[in-house]
Structure formats: structure tokens, C-alpha cells
Amino acid sequence: MMTGTIETTGNISAEKGGSIILQCHLSSTTAQVTQVNWEQQDQLLAICNADLGWHISPSFKDRVAPGPGLGLTLQSLTVNDTGEYFCIYHTYPDGTYTGRIFLEVLESSVAEHGARFQIP
């Protein structure tokens, strides 16, 4: 039975040119996390493997930094970075857990940094 839940930073906004931390946390399970994939729509941004550590996709190397923890830091944000991001936890015995974050990159300084809430 899959007992775990993914908590995420939910809907967040940030300023163009700034940076943002995408964070997910798997709780309520003792399942072994073998790997966490970070994806934007259908593009793989990064992988964190329990044994091998981090791998950042070559096309995102300049703007994506691993961490903190299993999270991901996006830098030099552009309006084109607006959209859905997914953290995909590969575990056993439970299987796969997926969390969703929506990032809106704003032109002005009215962006609410660190707005945190969970999407059901």
C-alpha cells in the first residue's frame, strides 16, 4: 500500500532574473527513495540518485543548481520558465510518487517570494 504523501511548495512566483527553490518532501512512509527526477512538462531537468548523487541535464547546467536537499534551485529566471514542475520520487516498495509545483515568473517586483501552500 502506498501510504506516503508528497508535500510541495505549491504555487510560487518569482521575479525575472531572480532565483527560486523548488522543494518537495516525501513523508508518512519508510519506503527507500532510489531516485528523484525533476521535470518541467516533458523535459528532464535533473536527477538525484541515492547512490550516484546529482546529474543536471546538459541544457540546464548553467541555470539549475542541485539542492538544498532533494530540492532544485532555478537561477536567472525568464518568463519562459513559467509553468508546471514535477518532482518524481522513485521508491521501493511503494513505487512512484509525484509532486506538482506551479511557478509563475513575473516581470515586476510584485512577485511573492516563498508563497507556500499545498495543492491537493
Epitope: 527507500q32 527513495v33 516498495p93
Partner: antibody, heavy 118, light 112 residues
Framework: EVQLVESGGGLVQPGGSLRLSCAAS????????MSWVRQAPGKGLEWVSE????????YYPDTVKGRFTISRDNSKNTLYLQMNSLRAEDTAVYYC???????????WGQGTLVTVSS | DVVMTQSPLSLPVTPGEPASISCRSS???????????LEWYLQKPGQSPKLLIY???NRFSGVPDRFSGSGSGTDFTLKISRVEAEDVGVYYC?????????FGGGTKVEIK
């Protein structure tokens, strides 16, 4: 090389307490769920507890629930088992174990003996 | 709780001959994820247990190919194609598809 070294076993009176430690090395401790398994003298293996990599989730069988507490210090690469209200039937060798490759107990320590007797 | 029942309790073997150990679970140990988390361990005298087989039929690294696992649902088997003297010890099956995690009672393999 993965190494797990248990310590803290010994002789304790019924109703007493003991804290076992498992020092881990050779891998990223904070990435792994960890477990304790015990074996009474001349008997089979029994799963005792497990804890998630972050320490936020734990499971126990009914035989030890409410008496044993598993915990970890990821900054010290150490797993713990706090055993309270000990009974004669808790006498056993206690092993810590780590998963790997889709297996739950891929790596084991050498064990530490706990004897509960008056 | 899932009860794991092993047979036989004791298995006298002749070196070079095959051997087989059965493990039955009281209910299906197919996990919701679709995987069957059934493992086999060998505990040699005076040693810690060692993993032989995981997910029913996968040999762990360094395990000789004379060991093989099979089965599905509730019925599982560990086979040793040609027993060697170093294979003596107690063999345990184990499931972690369900909590509590449970071991079989063990099968003692000894040389005739």
C-alpha cells in the same frame, strides 16, 4: 565499502532500558531507510523496526511498539534503538541493516547481544 | 500479518546434488506497485545473515549462479543446483510487501 557496526548491547534487568547504536560508513547514510532485525538465541530472524532516510517516518511490529524507539542522527551517520521496559523475550542479537538494489536488507552489521535477565 | 511458512524445517543434502526450499505466504505478497518483494537470506553458523535473492528471482551481487529463486503470488522456491559444503546454514525467506515485514521460520541445510 558499506560498513555497519552495532554497539551498546549488554546485560540488563527486566523492566530496564538500553540504547543500541549502529555506526554507518562507506555510503551516504542520509539517503537510506534503515532497519533493526533481531535473533533470539537458537531462533529465527525477526524484524524490529525501520526508519525513513529523513527520520520522519517509523514502523514497528506489535511485539515492540510503545517500548522501542528507532531514531537516527544523519550528521553522525548513526542509527539508534532505544529499548525500554525490556522483557526476557527481548534477549537477542540485534542487527542493523540497510537496503540496496531493490532489496530490504542488502547489508548487515555484525550484531550486538542484548541479554535481559535478573 | 503475513505469515511466511518454510519447508522443510531441516534439509540433509549431499554435495553435488540439488536442493530445494519452499516458502508460502498466508496471503499474496504482490505489492500495489506490481512488484513482489520476496527475498532469501542465508545465515552461516556464527555469522550475520547474507542476502542471496531479491524480488523473487534476482541474485544479489557475488551470489553464485547455482542459487536461483522462483515463484509468484503466495508460493516461492529457492533452488541450489549443486550443493557445496559452504552452503550449509539456515535459509530464511522474507517479505516486505506488507507491514509488518515478516520472515519465514528458517530451513537448516546440513551435509549428510
Amino acid at each position: 565499502e558499506v560498513q555497519l557496526v552495532e554497539s551498546g548491547g549488554g546485560l540488563v534487568q527486566p523492566g530496564g532500558s538500553l540504547r543500541l547504536s549502529c555506526a554507518a560508513s562507506g555510503f551516504t547514510f542520509s539517503s537510506y531507510t534503515m532497519s533493526w532485525v533481531r535473533q533470539a538465541p537458537g531462533k529465527g530472524l525477526e524484524w524490529v523496526s525501520e526508519i525513513s532516510s529523513s527520520g520522519g517516518s517509523t514502523y514497528y511490529p506489535d511485539t515492540v511498539k510503545g517500548r522501542f524507539t528507532i531514531s537516527r542522527d544523519n550528521s553522525k551517520n548513526t542509527l539508534y534503538l532505544q529499548m525500554n521496559s525490556l522483557r526476557a523475550e527481548d534477549t537477542a542479537v540485534y542487527y542493523c541493516a540497510r537496503p540496496g538494489l531493490g532489496a530490504w536488507f542488502a547489508y548487515w552489521g555484525q550484531g550486538t547481544l542484548v541479554t535481559v535477565s535478573s | 500479518d503475513v505469515v511466511m511458512t518454510q519447508s522443510p524445517l531441516s534439509l540433509p543434502v549431499t554435495p553435488g546434488e540439488p536442493a530445494s526450499i519452499s516458502c508460502r505466504s498466508s496471503q499474496s505478497i504482490v505489492h500495489n506497485s506490481g512488484n513482489t518483494y520476496l527475498e532469501w537470506y542465508l545465515q552461516k553458523p556464527g555469522q550475520s545473515p547474507k542476502l542471496l535473492i531479491y524480488k523473487v528471482s534476482n541474485r544479489f551481487s557475488g551470489v553464485p549462479d547455482r542459487f536461483s529463486g522462483s515463484g509468484s503470488g503466495t508460493d516461492f522456491t529457492l533452488k541450489i543446483s549443486r550443493v557445496e559444503a559452504e552452503d550449509v546454514g539456515v535459509y530464511y525467506c522474507f517479505q516486505f510487501s506488507h507491514v509488518p515485514r515478516t520472515f519465514g521460520g528458517g530451513t537448516k541445510v546440513e551435509i549428510k
